[in-house]
């Protein structure tokens, strides 16, 4: 969490950003909040990116003002216009690319004063893994698949019964480049699994950590997955 304060002149206002990660090829949100003003026409929001000459986005007098917008962001940004009045300056970013990573500044002017805060934005690819029993294999085998990761993640297997066990000798992980030649499909196979046990396939890179669990009993199979972004620090 980064909290910034205003500089000289008018009073300073508090601006808060949250470091976040964008999944390439999808929408991203750059989070920024500020002390609200009662008049929308008095609020100016500017988003800037380190190393980029033009603005990422500007919103003033109740509407977008894109005359200074850098070409790399044209048609790809929007604020949540109906939420600006309550202090939400977050930016929606279309079709996140690897090159969108970097340091952004959320700069706010209101009738109360000015303020800004920086935000570190990471980009990559992350997806939920799915763990299934591989019935084609000769022995009891689990297959963990996740369609899109970048950079290349690590894959670790764990089990509820054999806590702390190292499964690297009985697992095999492969990374297959997807058609766009950036992200990769992750496939990990775990051999010699036992019944009545819960196994977890954990996939992690510097952006996200995802876990796929599977519980195999004589009568049923239960699955659960979850994904967590690793760098959501507020400023």
């Amino acid at each position: 969490l980064i909290i910034g304060f205003g500089i000289s002149g008018r009073h300073s206002i508090t601006v808060t950003t949250v470091a976040s990660a964008g999944n390439i090829g999808e929408d991203g949100i750059l989070s920024c909040t500020f002390e609200p003003d009662i008049k929308l026409s008095d609020i100016v929001i500017q988003w800037l990116k380190e190393g980029v000459l033009g603005l990422v986005h500007e919103f003033k007098e109740g509407k977008d003002e894109l005359s200074e917008q850098d070409e790399m962001f044209r048609g790809r940004t929007a604020v949540f216009a109906d939420q600006v009045i309550v202090g939400n300056a977050s930016l929606r970013l279309k079709n996140v690319q690897l090159t969108d990573a970097g340091t952004y500044k959320c700069y706010i002017i209101t009738s109360k004063g000015k303020g800004n805060a920086n935000l570190e934005y990471k980009t990559g690819a992350f997806s939920m893994p799915e763990v299934n029993v591989d019935y084609n294999a000769s022995s009891e085998t689990l297959r963990c698949e996740a369609p899109r990761w970048f950079p290349q993640p690590t894959v670790v297997w764990a089990s509820q019964v054999d806590q702390g066990a190292n499964f690297s000798e009985v697992s095999n992980t492969s990374f297959e480049l997807n058609s766009e030649n950036v992200t990769m499909k992750v496939v990990s196979v775990l051999y010699n699994v036992t019944i009545n046990n819960t196994y977890s396939c954990m996939i992690e890179n510097d952006i996200a950590k995802a876990t796929g669990d599977i519980k195999v009993t004589e009568s049923e199979i239960k699955r659960r997955s979850h994904l967590q972004l690793l760098n959501s620090k507020a400023s």
Partner: antibody, heavy 121, light 107 residues
């Protein structure tokens, strides 16, 4: 309610130009991209290009570059498509459509009724 | 430029049938695929955007899915008013592109 009302049907000779208008109401005209799409008789949809009236920024399908010109008049909330050097293959219904997402170029969510342009000698 | 290859170009189905239409992008990955329904003499109507987000007022029998370069529109139980032509649209890049269309006819 978002409304896009287009100009009436046109008949043009090969080599001539046509200018189709699209009057917007029910939203802030300068805050949303407007796209243009055409459909030849019995054929599919073909994207021509789009314009952001708040700054005049445009994107064009390579096929129409140099022949199609997109403009917008913010005082009347009207977008225009001008197509020059017309040929018989340009006979089609031309649609304007608002792009969802304001300054973010989204999918086309509201459409005009279409304008039939016939090119015939 | 990204091309969208839509299949089939036409299909015959009965009321109550499950119908699936696919679109394949020539390159790249993004979730910016929309689906439109068009009836003769009418403007297209947006059904789904961002791969799977249903437009307000669109019946829940319509659904979208896909990832990578392959995207699907599914009508779970075809109704009489669903007989129309359907188009996919790729809108993630600078240049937008429609699929060639799929005409859904009565068997």
């Amino acid at each position: 309610e978002v409304q896009l009302v287009q100009s009436g049907a046109e008949v043009k000779k090969p080599g001539a130009s046509v200018k189709v208008s699209c009057k917007a109401s029910g939203y802030t005209f300068t805050s949303y991209w407007i796209g243009w799409v055409r459909q030849a008789p019995g054929q599919g949809l073909e994207w021509i290009g789009d314009i952001y009236p708040g700054g005049g920024y445009t994107n064009y399908n390579e096929k129409f570059k140099g022949r199609a010109t997109l403009t917008a008049d913010t005082s009347t909330s009207t977008a225009y498509l001008e197509l020059s050097s017309l040929r018989s293959e340009d006979t089609a219904v031309y649609y304007c459509a608002r792009l969802d997402g304001s300054s973010y170029r989204g999918a086309m969510d509201s459409w005009g009724q279409g304008t039939l342009v016939t090119v015939s000698s | 430029d990204i091309q969208m290859t839509q299949s089939p170009s036409s299909l015959s189905a009965s009321v109550g049938d499950r119908v699936t239409i696919t679109c394949k992008a020539s390159q790249g990955f993004n979730k910016y695929v929309a689906w439109y329904q068009q009836k003769p003499g009418k403007a297209p109507k947006l059904l789904i955007h961002y791969t799977s987000t249903l437009q307000p007022g669109v019946p829940s029998r319509f659904s979208g899915s896909g990832s990578g370069t392959d995207y699907t529109l599914t009508i779970s139980s075809l109704q009489p008013e669903d007989f129309a032509t359907y188009y996919c649209l790729q809108y993630g890049n600078l240049l937008y592109a429609f699929g060639q269309g799929t005409k859904v006819e009565i068997k």
